[in-house]
């Protein structure tokens, strides 16, 4: 959970589950220029571990939209065009804090929630075994 | 900001600025095991761009901590082990939410906020030009 | 458009130093490296010194390691390479490249001549 500090010129809470419940201003402060990935760079297509972005929608969960990638390839893409199937492409993904509506329809009430995207791909050696 | 539907069973909000502020409950659902990205797999050593992974540490943020890619190269890592410099190692960037404590220090006041992360390193092929 | 201009080439003697300068200007924005290459008659473009721009890492090819100092200037989009201890081996066109992660420019290149 969160490790809750106390200060004296902080907004009360009467909620007896607290510090289970607390109190989240929606005005989102942006430290980066809010971007479609697709734009943001074209990674997606000159990575030797091309990808594809999938667009994920759920109207009970803020962000309502997240892309996931899905590697276009099983190999890398080599200087030459083809894939090399001696490689691997592989997604990274990334553990990420979404607010879902609990309960559900609710505006003004939502439950953290941690879900697993794949953000890109990247290409890997693998690991070969020869099985006897 | 977030379509707000509405639902007679909700719980109600007297904040006359509803629905700019709500209540979260903090008991996250995980939709995945949470695990150090370093142990969840080692893509970060065997990519052809490969990274190190930072610790970003705020007691004013949730999550707290943060990991953060570093590529270890310039260039891309070919089969021999020696570094391609015609080719880029890049950061996979994504933005994710964040809770920060509004007013600082307060244990159940925060604010959302979007930050750029750097999640893990791929390898591109640049496009040349040559300058007169 | 992104224009290049290296300076700072000639010919030396052995043991010698010398320092190459390359100036971006134009649509220079988000910078990933920027750094020098540099090639020899009938043989491919070799990296020499790379400096990354959000961080200010630096990477050497090994020939030039403990010899070659990269350094750069945020506010003015340039890059230095001071070149100590050179050798006749060391003697190439060299190439500056503003490197924007996708895209990729080379100058037209400086010549070093280094004499035993």
């Known amino acids: 959970g969160i490790a809750i500090p106390r200060n004296s010129g902080c907004p009360n809470s009467e909620d007896k589950n607290f510090p289970r419940t607390v109190m989240v201003n929606l005005n989102i402060h942006n430290r980066n220029t809010s971007t479609n990935p697709k734009r943001s760079s074209d990674y997606y297509n000159r990575s030797t571990s091309p990808w594809n972005l999938h667009r994920n929608e759920d109207p009970e969960r803020y962000p309502s939209v997240i892309w996931e990638a899905k590697c276009r390839h099983l190999g890398c893409v080599k200087a030459d065009g083809n894939v090399d199937y001696h490689m691997n492409s592989v997604p990274i993904q990334q553990e990420i804090l979404v607010l879902r509506r609990e309960p559900r329809h609710c505006p003004n009430s939502f439950r953290l929630e941690k879900i697993l995207v794949s953000v890109g791909c990247t290409c890997v050696t693998p690991i070969v075994h020869h099985v006897a | 900001g977030i379509a707000i539907p509405r639902n007679s069973g909700c719980p109600n909000s007297e904040d006359k600025n509803f629905p700019r502020t709500v209540m979260v409950n903090l008991n996250i659902h995980n939709r995945n095991t949470s695990t150090n990205p370093k142990r969840s797999s080692d893509y970060y050593n065997r990519s052809t761009s490969p990274w190190n992974l930072h610790r970003n540490e705020d007691p004013e943020r949730y999550p707290s901590v943060i990991w953060e890619a570093k590529c270890r190269h310039l260039g891309c890592v070919k089969a021999d082990g020696n570094v391609d410099y015609h080719m880029n190692s890049v950061p996979i960037q994504q933005e994710i939410l964040v809770l920060r404590r509004e007013p600082r220090h307060c244990p159940n006041s925060f604010r959302l906020e979007k930050i750029l992360v750097s999640v893990g390193c791929t390898c591109v092929t640049p496009i040349v030009h040559h300058v007169a | 458009e992104v224009q290049l201009v290296e300076s700072g080439g000639g010919s030396v003697q052995a043991g010698d130093s010398l320092r190459l300068s390359c100036a971006a200007s134009?649509?220079?924005?988000?910078?990933?490296?920027f750094g020098w290459f540099r090639q020899t008659p009938g043989k491919e473009r070799e990296f020499v010194a790379g400096?990354?721009?959000?961080?200010?890492?630096?990477e050497y090819a090994n020939s030039v390691k403990g010899r070659f100092t990269i350094s750069r200037d945020n506010a003015k989009n340039t890059v230095d390479l001071q070149m100590d201890s050179l050798k006749p081996e060391d003697t190439a066109v060299y190439y500056c490249?503003?490197?924007?992660?996708?895209?990729?420019?080379w100058g037209q290149g400086t010549q070093v001549t280094v004499s035993s």
């Open positions: 400096i990354r721009w959000s961080d200010a890492y630096t």
């Open positions: 490249v503003l490197d924007l992660s996708t895209v990729r420019y």
């Open positions: 134009g649509r220079a924005n988000s910078i990933n490296w």
